[in-house]
């Protein structure tokens, strides 16, 4: 090999050990009778070497320093060349450096050619293996811009007071040219300016100087975007910290074109602006820090640049001002994250404040939006509590469970509304009146319809699901002791057409001991499941529930259990069942831990089926399953 | 199994010379460097300077450079330090070593030690 | 390149963790290695390219560091630990060695 430096190039040559390979003997260059790890060829020389390996792009590589001197002189503005070309140089990972000194005045614009710049943060890689890494000067000291990939949206760097630029090239990288320009601009009276163009929908991610390290104190950073007028831009904080300031507040300032408030200021912590249309710059202001304990002030942010959908236009109104202890979200359904673009789903607050999730509470009447391309990527979900604080004044007062009008109407699908109904402790129980009777979900008759009712108490310490019941089966009304949760659930977008099957009522009724009492009505012809709560758990432990089952006139009902033995071990106490006919009281009592099961059984009048539980042993818990037929009394079976 | 052997010791006049010698064995004796090493009593290492067998070439301390020659015999895998114009202060362990994968000095000899007494 | 290792001499009792630091004047990328010498005995290396452990060396024998900073940490140390410890730079000529950690067993 051989390289030649004109003189007065100011390029220098320094061909030294890359990173270590264990596997390869030594290598060297060699040089008249010498052989050397480092080789340094300044201006003027030429030098004639080989390497005494045959593969030398796995032990070394070469750095190539142009010094640009725009202090005593003019500058060389324009395209930048590779000098040495390429083709002249040993096939080594080769990174060009241009090292331009200027005035503080004199700004300096480093302009990308297609394909722009994509900004990697700490620890990323380049696919191609080709890395731009821009550095600029504050006085003494080196502030790193960035290390950037091709394939970006940035397209031009605007600094002053010097910049250097890295271009690393792996050896087997054909490149040939530099990619980029200089220009010489008027002072930019800040730390530096980047330019991010969208041709279209993408995202960047861009960070600020020294990123991970701390921005450069009480510097400011701009970033221009450059977005198509008919494309909306949302800004996402995805990493910052703060310093500790002594005098100014750190801050971003956006400049959005037509808004009546520029700039616009908004702490790191704040929500970002969302749904922007067209260009807008966005600039980090630093402080003055604490000498003492400084801090760092570091943002890695994300701008998200994507069609607005038709609802982005649209705003909804969310009149939450009657409503009391309610709270609504919208948020993303879980999916698997999928490795391609995906444009941003948002919801956006007075369309600006967007984010990917918003809750909404009570007391207030809210406007919202989506920038979104999906809205089925969102769901809803309401929490609302209801409680009675003195027993003298909620007793029989009812109330309705039904998801308000306002939120059906919004274009996003409900997956829960929950309701907490609270009572005092021992004064009062609940009842719930379904509009139309209940069905209890079981495996053997599952419900179909687009939601159903989850019923589960309320209470931290208890671990107790009654179960989940859907519209059109026989369960007439549900008591439950103390505090519960009742949510509705919708498993289906034709819910809105369904929805006027909803409907439930609460009412506050004088306490009572059991921890349930379903209240049942079987239609004829109809097969009713019935299950113990806590199926799969078990009841809890000295749990008790009883079923009213109403038997008309002409009917006879057939008691079946599912299995013949119940299955539960007892730690303490006993479990048991007692069905009890309520014209006659007579009543049979069962051992749940000792007896078989009975066999089925006919009522020809309504009963109770009530079933206690003692304290099982771990594993051994009490689940029952039981089914309810009548048919015609035709032929007396007494 | 990869060896250099040195020899025990060497007992020299002030202002005589010493040739040290280092046989490798157990590799491809072209393939690596053989770097010299001085150290003194109580004292670190310090690095002499290194031989290329396949180019002859050599590399020198700059504080050895004109008193200490490196030469290497091929044919018999040997490689050696002469030291010229010996004073006290020569006197130390020299040892010989591989420059391995890594470049890292990987296999040593057992040192020759070098007393230099009128 | 001046190799500077600290501290000079340091006493541990069996089952302590040693650290063993070794600076460099200037950057030597990751061309440090790290050598044993046990009284009367040649050096044995320990530590290639700063973190690559030598084949036999023992697993509490741990290289890190790059550019200007590089340690040696024995994370159990053993009575047979007991001796020199040397880095040196073969980044650039002349190679150069640090003055050494004796190391004493209590």
């Known amino acids: 090999f051989e390289i030649a430096l004109p003189r007065e190039s100011n390029i220098t040559v320094l061909i030294k050990l890359g990173t270590p390979t264990l596997l390869a003997k030594p290598c060297y260059i060699v040089i008249s009778k010498r052989h050397i790890t480092m080789l340094s060829i300044k201006s003027g020389e030429r030098i004639v070497f080989t390497f005494s390996c045959q593969s030398p792009e796995n032990h070394f590589v070469i750095e190539i320093q142009k010094n640009i001197d725009c202090m005593s002189g003019p500058c060389p503005f324009g395209e930048v060349q590779l000098q040495p070309s390429t083709s002249l140089l040993p096939t080594l990972n080769r990174t060009f450096i241009w090292d331009v000194k200027a005035h503080k005045s004199i700004g300096l614009e480093l302009q990308f050619s297609i394909p722009r710049l994509r900004q990697i943060g700490p620890g990323e890689s380049c696919p191609d293996g080709v890395t731009h890494s821009i550095s600029g000067r504050i006085d003494a000291t080196v502030v790193r811009i960035g290390t950037f990939c091709s394939n970006g949206t940035v397209s031009r760097i605007k600094m002053q007071e010097g910049v250097k630029m890295a271009l690393h090239l792996p050896w087997f990288h054909p490149r040939n040219v530099s990619g980029f320009s200089i220009a010489n601009r008027s002072s930019i009276k800040r730390l530096c300016i980047i330019e991010s163009v969208f041709e279209g929908e993408g995202s960047a991610t861009l960070m600020s100087a020294n990123y991970p390290e701390g921005f450069p104190e009480d510097e400011l950073m701009t970033w221009q975007f450059v977005v198509p007028a008919h494309l909306r831009a949302s800004v996402s904080f995805l990493n910052f910290n703060l310093s500790n300031c002594e005098r100014k507040e750190e801050r971003v300032e956006y400049y959005i074109p037509g808004s009546t408030t520029n700039p616009e200021v908004f702490k790191l912590e704040d929500k970002q602006p969302g749904n922007m249309a067209g260009n807008f710059n966005l600039s980090l202001q630093g402080c003055d820090q604490d000498a003492q304990s400084p801090g760092i002030l570091r943002l890695q942010f994300q701008v998200l640049v994507q069609h607005p959908q038709n609802e982005s236009n649209k705003i909804y109104v969310v009149d939450l001002s009657n409503e009391r202890a309610m709270s609504l979200t919208i948020e993303p359904r879980p999916v698997k994250q999928s490795r391609k673009f995906v444009p941003g789903c948002f919801v956006c607050l007075e369309s600006r404040t967007c984010s990917s999730n918003l809750t909404l509470t009570s007391g207030s009447k809210h406007k919202i939006s989506f920038l979104c391309d999906d809205l089925t990527r969102l769901w809803m979900n309401v929490e609302k509590t209801i409680s009675c604080t003195d027993h003298r004044y909620c007793q029989r007062k009812s109330y309705s469970l039904q998801v308000p009008s306002d939120i059906l109407h919004l274009p996003v699908e409900l997956h829960d509304f929950s309701w907490k109904l609270l009572v005092p402790k021992d004064r009062l129980s609940l009842v719930l009146v379904p509009a139309q009777k209940l069905q209890q979900h079981t495996h053997e008759k599952p419900c179909n319809t687009s939601f159903s009712y989850l019923v589960a108490s309320a209470i931290p310490s208890q671990d107790l699901y009654f179960g989940s019941f859907c519209p059109g089966g026989s369960i007439k009304q549900i008591q439950v002791k103390q505090n519960i949760s009742v949510t509705l659930r919708t498993f289906a977008p034709s819910f809105q057409q369904e929805a006027s099957r909803q409907g439930l009522t609460v009412s506050f009724i004088p306490y009572f001991k059991e921890e349930g009492v379903f209240t049942v009505t079987p239609d004829t012809k109809s097969k009713v499941y019935l299950r113990t709560p806590n199926w799969d758990r078990g009841l809890p432990s000295l749990t008790s529930v009883s079923w009213n089952i109403s038997v008309p006139r002409d009917q006879v009902a057939c008691l079946t259990f599912f299995k013949e033995r119940s299955g539960v071990v007892c730690q303490t106490g006993r479990a048991f069942m007692i069905i009890q006919e309520q014209r006659t009281r007579a009543e049979e009592i069962f051992s749940l831990d000792e007896d078989v099961l009975p066999k089925p059984s006919f009522h020809h009048h309504s009963f109770w089926v009530n079933i206690s539980n003692c304290s099982p042993t771990s594993g051994k818990q009490l689940d029952l399953l039981f089914s309810v037929t009548l048919t015609p009394r035709t032929v007396d079976l007494t | 199994e990869v060896q250099l052997q040195q020899f025990g010791a060497e007992l020299v006049k002030p202002g005589a010379s010493v040739k040290i010698s280092c046989k490798a064995s157990?590799?491809?004796?072209?393939?690596?460097?053989i770097e010299w090493l001085k150290q003194s009593h109580g004292k670190s290492l310090e690095w002499i300077g290194d031989?290329?067998?396949?180019?002859?070439?050599?590399n020198y301390n700059q504080k050895f450079k004109g008193r200490a020659t490196l030469t290497v015999d091929k044919s018999s895998s040997t490689a050696y330090m002469e030291v010229r114009s010996l004073t006290s202060e020569d006197t130390a362990v020299y040892y010989c070593?591989?420059?391995?994968?890594?470049?890292?000095?990987?296999?040593w000899g057992q040192g020759t030690s070098v007393t230099v007494s009128s | 390149i001046v190799m500077t290792q600290s501290p000079q001499s340091m006493s541990m009792s069996v089952g302590e963790r040693v650290t063993l630091s070794c600076k460099a004047s200037e950057n030597v990328g990751a061309y440090v290695s790290w050598f044993q010498q046990k009284p009367d005995q040649s050096p044995k290396l320990l530590i290639l390219?700063?973190?690559n452990r030598y084949t036999g060396v023992p697993a509490r024998f741990i290289g890190s560091g790059s550019a200007t900073d590089f340690t040696l940490t024995i994370s159990s140390v053993q009575a047979e630990d007991l001796a020199d410890y040397h880095c040196?730079?073969?980044?650039?000529?002349?190679?150069?060695f640090g003055g050494g950690t004796k190391l004493e067993i209590k």
């Open positions: 040196g730079q073969s980044y650039t000529y002349p190679y150069t």
């Open positions: 157990g590799y491809s004796f072209s393939d690596f460097n």
């Open positions: 031989i290329n067998p396949n180019y002859d070439s050599t």
């Open positions: 390219a700063a973190s």
């Open positions: 070593a591989r420059l391995g994968y890594g470049y890292a000095m990987d296999y």
